[in-house]
């Protein structure tokens, strides 16, 4: 039975709540309020139903046997619940229109909704409250307004913001004023005088954060209240005058041709003015722009000083002007609260330079182009130049230098190294290009001692061809040993020039002598199928590394196709 | 040619915001500002505010402060208002309206007929 | 906020007969740097938008009839018709842009006699 009447209780309940909502004039939630209250200090706040919506206030509604309630939704929560007003010590309480938190705690983040009712009538709207915390120096998230103050112009005030009701006439708080995380005391030009802060000369570097700390107690405890407010020294109204055009003026005049692009510039100083609007525009034979059937373009830029006086740039452009437009009338306006002021831009067209200069012009282009071209083609033929150029009159290196090999390959002892190295750089250096090569694997006797025979191998070769990959790299190698000796020979005797060959990209690399010659040195990269080609860049790059030498080489194009063939199939 | 049109009527209940929107075609839409009219039945014109679809400058008339904002879309020409809290003598036909600065509202758009009831 | 009046509320007049519309603001809208006096008259038939007829006083825009001229200094201006026409018949609106708000008349009701 008693099941059944707790059932019926609900049901009844949730009818009466649902036809009460439907009859609920609801506000929505005020965004305008957007009420931030530090953590641990009282917070009062007004029922917005009376200030903004309704048009009586709460005593007429009380008086009118109107009904206030207050209830509220936690952050990220959709369920509205009651507010809880049998807290210890009061905590949180309602008083006539007020909703009083002694102090906020962090979790009292939420949407809070006042609702006034009776049996025939009700409104109700929301607005939300947000709970932040502070650190030692004041610094929070919390939405600071903006104090101005005009620089020298004499005493100028602040007050201690939002903290009327929150004690009685006949307590007085202790008021602590900060800037930013220091105490004001002994500051030349800024003193706290209670609730109020003195400016007695407002200067630029008096910009910054202020913090009253209000100290009062209230019923055997002590609450704080802390106001932070942003002061921006600004302009001076003494000083302010209505807005000067810089351009266009007097001295500049836009001449220009049919066809060029004509830019007018249109730069207006504006004197700071508070709640003033600064507005730069133009016009065209006294219209609109838009009225005017050219294709006409306005850009604006806009700079402050640090004192917030502005100055607007709008760019008339006209892409290509016609002997028409460099008739018409461009006036530039700007307007502040101080006045309204114009300035037109002279525009005219010039007169056609003379004949000869086309010629000149002409001459001087075609000068410009040939040695561009020139350029051009040094830069993409640049090898071929060399080499041509070392084939017809270029000295064999060879004759009489005492060496036995053209070139000593060295590289990392690896199945794919070793294949590049004995099939594809050999068969092209040795049988395309007639050089003779020294292979150590291939060229040394069995049973010799390898540094010995490595050294001896390297100061017979006119170039140490050095095969990068990151096998390459690893410690104590052979190949390792002969980068090394190679380099010392070339630093120090200077007889022997070491040639980087990148057959596979290396990361960083620890080892010290690679990293010089990589700074040092041009670093040939083998580009995969790209590179295998006998008459590309990477063998065109290679034979300018290499000795000059006049020996009769094999090049009919019947064997380079032959060569090139056999290259695709390593 | 240039031509302002506006979004379809709406009826709104007292308490609830309204977003009417106004997209501008035939001309450079950041060269000029963008008014609010309104005009309750029967009754005279009425402004509300500006918007300088350039700077993103806005001002508006004290009576809609705190209830009316102003916002614009540059990529498709539009602007927006949206009166919030509406109450039923809010219910007029809203106009949006261009000028080129200080020249007076030269194109107007068709109105949009906002209705408060409950 | 400047206040702007109209007189009369409305009239009547036969058609090719002038009409004279009065307005005046309760404050001078008159541009001393640049002489001229920011205020506009619109046409507003009914169920459609205002239409613009005039700018800084006297300016006609492009595509109004020569037969509307506005004129007036500082506080006190007029809209005439030189010549009434059928499809004169409006309600006719003088508006400040001197100072925002910027803020229009009650309005003028034109009729055919």
């Known amino acids: 039975m008693t099941l059944l009447w707790c059932v019926v209780s609900l049901y009844f309940y949730g009818i009466l709540q649902s036809d009460a909502s439907e009859r609920c004039d609801d506000w929505g939630l005020d965004t305008m309020r957007q009420i931030q209250v530090f953590e641990d200090e009282p917070a009062r706040i007004k029922c917005p139903l009376f200030e903004h919506f309704l048009k009586f206030n709460y005593s007429t509604a009380h008086s009118a046997g109107l009904t206030l309630i207050w209830y509220w939704t936690r952050q990220d929560r959709d369920l509205e619940e009651p507010i809880n007003f049998r807290l210890p010590e009061n905590r949180i309480s309602k008083e006539k229109d007020v909703l009083w938190f002694r102090p906020t705690l962090l979790n009292d983040t939420g949407n809070y909704t006042c609702m006034l009712r009776n049996t025939t009538y009700c409104s109700k709207v929301a607005f939300p409250l947000e709970v932040v915390q502070k650190d030692s120096c004041f610094n929070s998230p919390m939405k600071l307004p903006v104090h101005k103050l005009y620089i020298e112009y004499g005493i100028q005030r602040i007050t201690c913001p939002n903290v009327d009701g929150y004690f009685p006439s006949s307590v007085k708080p202790t008021i602590t004023w900060y800037m930013g995380c220091y105490k004001i005391q002994n500051f030349n030009n800024v003193i706290p005088e209670g609730m109020n802060l003195s400016f007695l000369i407002a200067l630029i570097s008096n910009n910054g954060n202020y913090t009253c700390v209000v100290t009062y107690p209230e019923n055997g405890r002590t609450f704080h209240l802390t106001r932070t407010l942003t002061v921006k020294v600004v302009g001076s109204p003494k000083n302010a005058v209505p807005p000067v055009i810089h351009s266009p003026n007097d001295h500049v005049v836009y001449e220009k041709e049919p066809g060029e692009e004509l830019l007018i510039p249109c730069t207006v100083y504006f004197s700071f003015l508070m709640d003033s609007r600064n507005e730069v525009w133009w016009t065209i034979d006294g219209k609109k722009p838009d009225d005017i059937t050219i294709d006409v373009t306005i850009n604006e830029s806009i700079s402050h000083s640090r004192t917030e006086d502005e100055t607007r740039t709008q760019i008339l452009s006209i892409k290509k002007v016609t002997s028409e437009d460099l008739k018409r009338s461009y006036v530039c306006h700007a307007r502040s609260a101080k006045g309204e002021v114009a300035k037109a831009a002279k525009v005219k067209q010039k007169v056609p330079a003379p004949r000869y200069t086309v010629e000149l012009a002409c001459g001087f282009g075609a000068t410009v182009l040939l040695v561009v071209i020139l350029i051009v083609v040094y830069h993409v033929y640049w090898l071929e130049m060399v080499l041509f150029y070392r084939a017809h009159f270029g000295t064999d290196e060879t004759i009489l230098d005492g060496k036995e090999y053209d070139i000593y390959v060295s590289y990392a002892r690896n199945a794919e190294e070793e294949e590049f190295v004995l099939l594809t750089l050999r068969g092209v250096l040795e049988n395309e290009f007639g050089y003779k090569l020294c292979i150590f694997d291939r060229d040394s006797l069995p049973g010799g001692i390898v540094t010995d025979e490595t050294l001896s191998f390297i100061q017979k070769s006119r170039r140490l061809l050095v095969v990068l990959s990151p096998n390459y790299v690893l410690q104590g190698t052979q190949a390792l040993l002969e980068l090394k000796a190679g380099l010392e020979n070339m630093a120090s005797r200077g007889n022997i020039n070491v040639i980087l060959v990148q057959y596979k990209a290396v990361k960083e690399t620890k080892v010290k002598e690679l990293k010089r010659a990589k700074t040092v040195l041009t670093v040939i990269k083998w580009k995969g199928e790209k590179s295998k080609y006998p008459q590309g860049r990477f063998w065109k790059q290679l034979q300018v590394a290499m000795p000059v030498k006049k020996s009769p080489r094999r090049s009919s194009s019947d064997e380079q196709g032959l060569s090139y063939s056999s290259l695709k199939n390593v | 040619q240039v031509q302002l049109f506006q979004s379809g009527a709406e009826v709104k209940k007292p308490g609830a915001s309204v977003k009417v929107s106004c997209k501008a075609s035939?001309?450079?839409?950041?060269?000029?500002?963008v008014h609010w009219v309104r005009q309750a039945p029967g009754q005279g014109l009425e402004w509300m505010g500006w918007?300088?679809?350039?700077?993103?400058?806005?001002d508006y008339a004290q009576k809609f402060q705190g209830r009316v904002t102003m916002t614009w879309d540059t990529s498709i020409s539009t602007a927006y208002m949206e009166l919030s809290r509406l109450r039923s003598d809010d219910t007029a036909v809203y106009y949006c309206?261009?000028?080129?600065?200080?020249?007076?509202?030269?194109?107007w758009g068709q109105g949009t007929t906002v209705t408060v009831s409950s | 906020d400047i206040v702007m009046t109209q007189s009369p509320d409305s009239l009547a007049v036969s058609l090719g007969e002038r009409a004279t519309i009065n307005c005046k603001s309760s404050?001078?809208?008159?541009?001393?740097?640049?002489?001229?006096?920011?205020l506009a008259w619109y046409q507003q038939k009914p169920g459609q938008p205002p239409k613009f007829l005039i700018y800084?006083?006297?300016t006609r825009e492009s595509g109004v009839p020569d037969r509307f001229s506005g004129s007036g200094s500082g506080t006190d201006f007029t809209l005439t018709i030189s010549s009434l026409q059928a499809e004169d018949v409006a309600v006719y609106y003088c508006?400040?842009?001197?100072?925002?708000?910027?803020?229009f008349g009650p309005g003028t009701k034109v009729d055919i006699k």
């Open positions: 404050q001078s809208v008159l541009y001393s740097s640049n002489n001229t006096s920011y």
């Open positions: 035939g001309y450079t839409f950041t060269g000029y500002y």
């Open positions: 918007i300088n679809p350039n700077s993103g400058g806005t």
């Open positions: 800084w006083t006297s």
């Open positions: 309206a261009r000028s080129y600065y200080y020249y007076g509202m030269d194109v």
């Open positions: 508006q400040q842009y001197y100072i925002t708000p910027f803020t």
